[in-house]
């Protein structure tokens, strides 16, 4: 089972674009676009801070932490109104991700 050039294996993703804006002090805003080849019942999401294919129910219910989006050892919390999630590092630093 050979993949054509540019073709992704089923269930995998790749980062297409990554834009960073560090103009604001102590704050970096990153916008990432990924390309995924998800199986039936899956949809593009984030697992361990990388693009991945996740159970579509997670996106529908906005239970973002069920994607396991944070790195090991980080705590995941939903934002108010489930517009995204935060990953809290053991040292207390918080990374916020909003879904658009």
């Amino acid at each position: 089972q050979f993949l054509k050039e540019g073709q992704l294996a089923a269930g995998t993703c790749e980062i297409v674009t990554l834009d960073r804006d560090s103009s604001q002090p102590r704050r970096t805003i990153a916008r990432q676009t990924a390309r995924c080849a998800c199986r039936k019942g899956q949809i593009a999401g984030t697992t361990r801070n990388k693009p991945s294919c996740v159970d579509a129910r997670i996106i529908k219910t906005k239970q973002w932490c069920d994607m396991l989006p944070c790195l090991e050892g980080e705590g995941c919390d939903l934002l108010i109104n489930r517009s995204g999630w935060t990953c809290t590092q053991p040292g207390g630093r918080i990374k916020t991700t909003t879904v658009s």
Epitope: T12, R39, R48, Q63, L68, C70, C76
Partner: antibody, heavy 120, light 107 residues
Framework: QVQLQESGPGLVKPSETLSLTCTVS????????WSWIRQPPGKGLEWIGY???????NYNPSLKSRVTISVDTSKNQFSLNLKSVTAVDTAVYYC??????????????WGQGTTVTVSS | DIQMTQSPSSLSASVGDRITISCRAS??????LNWYQQTPGKAPRLLIY???TLQSGVPSRFSGGGSGTDFSLTITSLQPEDFATYYC?????????FGQGTKLDIK
Amino acid sequence: QVQLQESGPGLVKPSETLSLTCTVSGGSISSYYWSWIRQPPGKGLEWIGYIYPSGSTNYNPSLKSRVTISVDTSKNQFSLNLKSVTAVDTAVYYCARVNPFGYYYAMDVWGQGTTVTVSS
Amino acid sequence: DIQMTQSPSSLSASVGDRITISCRASQSISTSLNWYQQTPGKAPRLLIYGASTLQSGVPSRFSGGGSGTDFSLTITSLQPEDFATYYCQESASIPRTFGQGTKLDIK
């Protein structure tokens, strides 16, 4: 180092409910998926289901009408309830951690297993 | 459901031998395949995930390969502790299904 420990009665009467608990130590239950697997005497492994940090679940359709998996994050525990048991539910029951290695979900930490016999 | 079929069901070999166990999926699962080892009275142990990636702490004499529907687990230079039952498991769909197992014993 994460360790899992199953607990619950070793003998359950037919038609009753089998209840097991898996206690997770050495790590947070909120950072992974968790699973139950069983193995009847002398046979192979059967996947029972998953639970996600939020409490959402995925079950084996062959058991779906009888099984409930729940999580208690405050106690770092997740549980299995299997109702209306019969002799065919006699098995060693394992709990396991499900690790997303990139795109590949695998059960990388297992409890030692607990034997449940269904008999009157 | 995806069916996983292992062959052979049992296998006899000697210390130092090289052996290969096969696993076939009833439909394509890309490389979403895991291998486990189980010794009597013990819980299964993850050996390989993603068809070919060795789990941390697993000796390099174990290797996995394949994609789509056909997979293999190879052990080079068998050691006494390798005599056990081996299971493949797909992680591409619900329900997760295991192969029926391959029992490896000493010739």
